[in-house]
């Protein structure tokens, strides 16, 4: 049977390579059965996660999957770094895997690696 | 309604090139990395190459590497497969294919264009 | 490279019964309680429908007689009550790993 246990959806090791200065969405996929859980985005700083409370988010629905969403309007340099989602269901907490930002500077844009190059680093980039 | 419609196949000479479109719509596309998928004639499925929502990740199968080249053109909504140095071996029908969830699945696929090389 | 090893290669069921298709990978598709396996259906002239992603959550509109279980190495695809539509070829896929890799295919007759 299909679990009807809420599950995330970011895949491991997911990375976007993105320009400051750009609008960028960050999704968290959802599923879920009944209630839509209460949902939140955070920051990984080492080995702690800070929330992020004061930030556009929203939501959106796709198929049988609800996207919360983290915008960024515009990205910012210090955007950089890994994010998580965790969803809180009947007094559980799920948490994503986390998603990590790559994060150009726009004054530094010139400098940003080739196309091909980009595909011979995976680990610069995302699914 | 989401819609992906291949164009592009057709007859092609050993050693020749060929390039097949994916047209996009129903869908923010810029949004949706995408596959190419081809099926040899009563034969199997085989992955062919990915290209993420930005451009920036690019992969493809060892089969085509360095001969085919995955891209897009999100304004207009399109997807590309630039094949060349075709071989018997490639003579297939090509399908492009929505990505889901970012590198879960493929949730939607074009009808496919088919691709004959042959002398 | 991943090898998915389906199995049977054809069956027939009769209608009403239950198709069971296994699916075993050459190495784990696994990771941190995640399990990246898909199943597709495809019928003859036709492109090949998600069923099934992430093992066992039915894609949208997808009925509820298909259902997908396993985890580490060995899959399955069950369609239980089996009807007449569902005769088709299905294919096991993994996305754990780059290049994504299928099954070779079950061929599904219905008695």
């Known amino acids: 049977k299909e679990s009807c246990d809420v599950q995330l959806y970011i895949k491991r090791q997911s990375e976007h390579s993105i320009l400051a200065g750009d609008p960028f969405e960050l999704e968290c996929p959802v599923k879920y059965c009944a209630n839509r859980p209460h949902v939140t985005w955070c920051k990984l700083n080492g080995t702690t996660c800070v929330k992020l409370e004061d930030r556009q988010t929203s939501w959106k629905e796709e198929k049988n999957i609800s996207f919360f969403i983290l915008h960024f309007e515009p990205v910012l340099p210090n955007d950089n770094g890994s994010y998580r989602c965790s969803a809180n269901f009947q007094s559980n907490l799920i948490e994503s895997h986390s998603t990590t930002l790559y994060v150009t500077d726009v004054k530094s844009a010139s400098e940003r690696p080739s196309k091909d190059e980009m595909a011979s680093r995976p680990w610069l980039l995302y699914r | 309604d989401v819609q992906l419609v291949e164009s592009g196949g057709g007859l092609v000479q050993p050693g020749g090139s060929r390039k097949l479109s994916c047209a996009a719509s129903?869908?923010?596309?810029?949004?949706?990395?995408m596959h190419w998928v081809r099926q040899a004639p009563e034969k199997g499925l085989e992955w062919v190459a990915y290209i993420s929502s930005g451009i920036s990740t690019i992969y493809y199968a060892d089969t085509v590497k360095g001969r085919f080249t995955i891209s897009r053109d999100n304004p207009k909504n399109t997807l590309f497969l630039q094949m060349t140095s075709l071989r018997s071996e490639d003579t297939a029908m090509y399908y492009c294919?929505?990505?889901?969830?970012?590198?879960?699945?493929?949730?939607?696929w074009g009808q496919g264009t088919s691709v004959t090389v042959s002398s | 490279d991943i090898v998915l090893t389906q199995s049977p290669a054809s069956l027939a069921v009769s209608l009403g019964q239950r198709a069971t298709i296994s699916c075993k990978a050459s190495?784990?598709?696994?990771?941190?309680?995640?399990?990246?396996m898909n199943w597709y259906q495809q019928k003859p002239g036709q492109p090949p429908k998600l069923l099934i992603y992430?093992?066992?959550n039915l894609d949208f509109g997808i009925p509820a007689r298909f259902s997908g279980s396993g985890s580490g190495t060995d899959f399955t695809l069950n369609i239980h009550p089996v009807e007449e539509e569902d005769a088709a070829t299905y294919y096991c896929?993994?996305?754990?790993?780059?290049?994504?890799?299928f099954g070779g295919g079950t061929k599904l007759e219905i008695k």
């Open positions: 896929q993994q996305s754990n790993e780059d290049p994504w890799t």
């Open positions: 992430a093992a066992s």
């Open positions: 129903g869908f923010t596309f810029s949004s949706f990395g």
């Open positions: 294919a929505r990505d889901w969830l970012r590198g879960y699945a493929m949730d939607y």
């Open positions: 190495q784990s598709i696994d990771y941190d309680g995640d399990s990246y």
